[in-house]
């Protein structure tokens, strides 16, 4: 007996959108030559930060998302950086001032491009996650089919 392919809707984990937005902001600000390498270093630096400070930006992000539904959850964990906005800048920032001088477009055009780029980057990551989920679901359904046949 075969089990029909599940059309269960998987929700993007809370705080994940927040992480992607952080990465997107850094990519737009730092403009690396190698975006995948930059993303890897970015997430690595967040993990290091989490280990050192016990502050998890993803958890914080999920609480920000929950704020609408439950104000108390938001009060539980304040981010340690809150007092110093300068510290909010990523650990992998550091491009010098000179860079901004050489950017091609007017600031208005840049803003539009950055918005479009942000959407593209986030969509690409979400697409990747969706594909991974689909792979898992397919594997699970195949395993279930095999189990049924072996009965």
């Amino acid at each position: 007996m075969s089990i029909p392919f599940s059309n269960t809707h998987y929700r993007i984990p809370q705080g994940f959108g927040n992480l992607l937005e952080g990465l997107t902001r850094e990519i737009l600000r730092e403009q690396p030559d190698n975006i995948p390498a930059f993303a890897a270093a970015y997430f690595e630096s967040l993990l290091e930060k989490r280990e050192k400070t016990n502050f998890d930006p993803a958890e914080w992000g999920s609480k920000v998302e929950d704020r609408f539904y439950n104000n108390h959850a938001f009060e539980e964990q304040e981010p340690p950086e809150k007092s110093d906005p300068k510290q909010e800048e990523s650990q992998i920032s550091g491009k010098e001032e000179e860079t901004s001088v050489t950017i091609l477009d007017s600031s208005e055009e840049d803003k539009e491009k950055e918005e479009v780029a942000a959407v593209k980057i986030q969509a690409a990551f979400r697409g990747h996650i969706a594909r991974e989920e689909a792979k898992k679901m397919k594997t699970n359904s195949l395993q279930n089919e095999e189990k049924e046949e072996n009965k």
């Epitope: 990519i27 737009l28 730092e30 403009q31 690396p32 030559d33 190698n34 975006i35 995948p36 390498a37 930059f38 890897a40 270093a41 630096s45 650990q91 992998i92 920032s93 550091g94 491009k95 010098e96 000179e98 860079t99 050489t102 950017i103 091609l104 477009d105 840049d110 491009k113 950055e114 479009v116 780029a117 593209k120 980057i121």
Partner: antibody, heavy 123, light 112 residues
């Protein structure tokens, strides 16, 4: 394995413009910046600028600002470098370059280069 | 704009001997991510440049282990443990810590 294929040699008159293309084949195009580097006869390497296709943002060296335009067409995985108001000093070999997917550096590390395009500016 | 100064500009070496090229930057190439954004390239006669070393000391794929990069901040060195005939060409360092990216003047290695 990613490869960069550049357009053929050009002979131009002073004051005119030249547009050199650089087509990437194999691998991902949008997530890796393409830089343009030129080399005048008997001289060293000179970075002109770059474009990050997914962002649509280009950066230029001050020396070329206002004369160079770098663009990218994601649908054809091709980057372009257009240099205007040409003068004899612009006679050079023009290279496009980018990092490969193997490289772990966020900046630089150009391990893929085009074969070069010779641009001769002569009246 | 960062300035890179290479030395020597000319380097005659006998096959099998070691060789060393220095690259000095006018300001630090160390970013807050802990990496030195300095690359070494070799341009053989009539060819496109090829990457030898990136991030100051990471050998690029397919580069023989006789090539090694070292240094941090403003002072960097490319060493060839035993020069071979195929190593002739011009060696360039390049900083990638900020745009505009800048190349050194180049060091011409020739066989004695």
């Amino acid at each position: 394995q990613v490869q960069l294929q550049q357009s053929g040699a050009e002979v131009k008159k002073p004051g005119s413009s030249v547009k050199v293309s650089c087509k990437a084949s194999g691998g991902t195009f949008s997530s890796y910046a393409i830089s343009w580097v030129r080399q005048a006869p008997g001289q060293g390497l000179e970075w002109m600028g770059r474009i990050i296709p997914i962002l649509g943002i280009a950066n230029y060296a001050q020396k070329f600002q206002g004369r160079v335009t770098i663009t990218a067409d994601k649908s054809t995985s091709t980057a372009y470098m257009e240099l205007s108001s040409l003068r004899s000093e612009d006679t050079a070999v023009y290279y496009c370059a980018r990092p490969s997917e193997e490289v772990v550096a966020a900046y630089g590390a150009f391990d893929i280069w085009g074969q070069g395009t010779t641009v001769t500016v002569s009246s | 704009e960062i300035v890179l100064t290479q030395s020597p500009l000319s380097l005659p070496v006998r096959p099998g001997e070691p060789a060393s090229i220095s690259c000095r930057a006018s300001q630090s190439l160390l970013r807050s991510d802990g990496f030195n954004y300095l690359d070494w390239y070799l341009q053989k006669p009539g060819q496109s440049p090829q990457l030898l070393v990136y991030l100051g000391s990471n050998r690029a794929s397919g580069v023989p282990d006789r090539f090694s990069g070292s240094g941090s901040g403003t002072d960097f060195t490319l060493k060839i443990s035993r020069v071979e005939a195929e190593d002739v060409g011009v060696y360039y360092c390049m900083q990638a810590v900020q745009t505009p990216y800048i190349f050194g003047q180049g060091t011409k290695l020739e066989i004695k």
